[in-house]
């Protein structure tokens, strides 16, 4: 019998990506961040 093919594959998990910009004062510019699943990663 031939073997059945099993792929490594991956499951797709959907998460909300939220970009935000925060003004921290006229002299300090802005912070731009990326929030993934409630955690700021950039």
């Amino acid at each position: 019998d031939a073997e059945f093919r099993h792929d490594s594959g991956y499951e797709v998990h959907h998460q909300k990506l939220v970009f935000f910009a925060e003004d921290v004062g006229s002299n300090k510019g802005a912070i731009i961040g990326l929030m993934v699943g409630g955690v700021v990663i950039a």
């Epitope: 019998d1 073997e3 059945f4 099993h6 792929d7 594959g9």
Partner: antibody
Framework: QVTLKESGPGILQSSQTLSLTCSFS??????????VSWIRQPSGKGLEWLAH???????RYNPSLKSRLTISKDTSRNQVFLKITSVDTADTATYYC?????????????WGQGTLVTVSA | DVLMTQTPLSLPVSLGDQASISCRSS???????????LEWYLQKPGQSPKLLIY???NRFSGVPDRFSGSGSGTDFTLKISRVEAEDLGVYYC?????????FGAGTKLELK
């Protein structure tokens, strides 16, 4: 969530071609590793695996029926199809489509409700 | 084809009992990737089969821990530690290593 639903003719005559459709949602058959099988079950009897189609259009068939089976898919419409030629009364069964879990773990984790097909002599 | 032989075909139990179902494959179902694709399904009357166990001993999500799978090579067992009413139905073992994929004939778990 993942759902699958089979549809078919209900009743057909011996020697005709059976065409079945599996319409699904909650996943895409273009996703790497994804695959859907057709499985049938005559009333009161056991389960028989028929065919499987992979995300990349590779296919596997049950050798005992291979000459009569054709599995195909329409990725954009989220559908998988099965054709069985030259049916006879022995093909009377409930036909299920089922999705295997993605990756090396395996397991038919998601099944449709099944569609009953009766072949009359 | 890989023949999957289940015993017993009928298993009368009382609620609260332990139940054990055996499944033997006619050849090794260890895949070349190292995994053993032995699975167990439960089918209740009028319903589609439901996945209980994959890769011999792994419970699928939502499956109670009273279900356990064991075995290797060609001999496998499904155990239910304390049978509940919702466990009644037909249990199928299945191998997903070789084409054609094959099911056992089924074991009907029913009340005495």
């Amino acid at each position: 969530q993942v759902t699958l639903k089979e549809s078919g003719p209900g009743i057909l005559q011996s020697s005709q071609t059976l065409s079945l459709t599996c319409s699904f949602s909650g996943f895409s058959l273009s996703t790497s590793g994804m695959g859907v099988s057709w499985i049938r079950q005559p009333s009161g009897k056991g389960l028989e695996w028929l065919a499987h189609i992979y995300w990349d259009d590779d296919k596997r068939y049950n050798p005992s029926l291979k000459s009569r089976l054709t599995i195909s898919k329409d990725t954009s419409r989220n559908q998988v199809f099965l054709k069985i030629t030259s049916v006879d009364t022995a093909d009377t069964a409930t036909y299920y489509c089922a999705r295997r879990r993605n990756g090396y773990d395996g397991g038919f984790a998601y099944w449709g409700q099944g569609t009953l097909v009766t072949v009359s002599a | 084809d890989v023949l999957m032989t289940q015993t017993p075909l009928s298993l009368p139990v009382s609620l609260g009992d332990q139940a054990s179902i055996s499944c033997r494959s006619s050849q090794s179902i260890v895949h070349s990737n190292g995994n053993t694709y032995l699975e167990w399904y439960l089918q209740k009357p009028g319903q589609s089969p439901k996945l209980l166990i994959y890769k011999v001993s792994n419970r699928f999500s939502g499956v109670p821990d009273r279900f356990s799978g064991s075995g290797s090579g060609t001999d496998f067992t499904l155990k239910i530690s304390r049978v509940e009413a919702e466990d009644l139905g037909v249990y199928y073992c299945f191998q997903g290593s070789h084409v054609p994929l094959t099911f056992g004939a089924g074991t009907k778990l029913e009340l005495k």
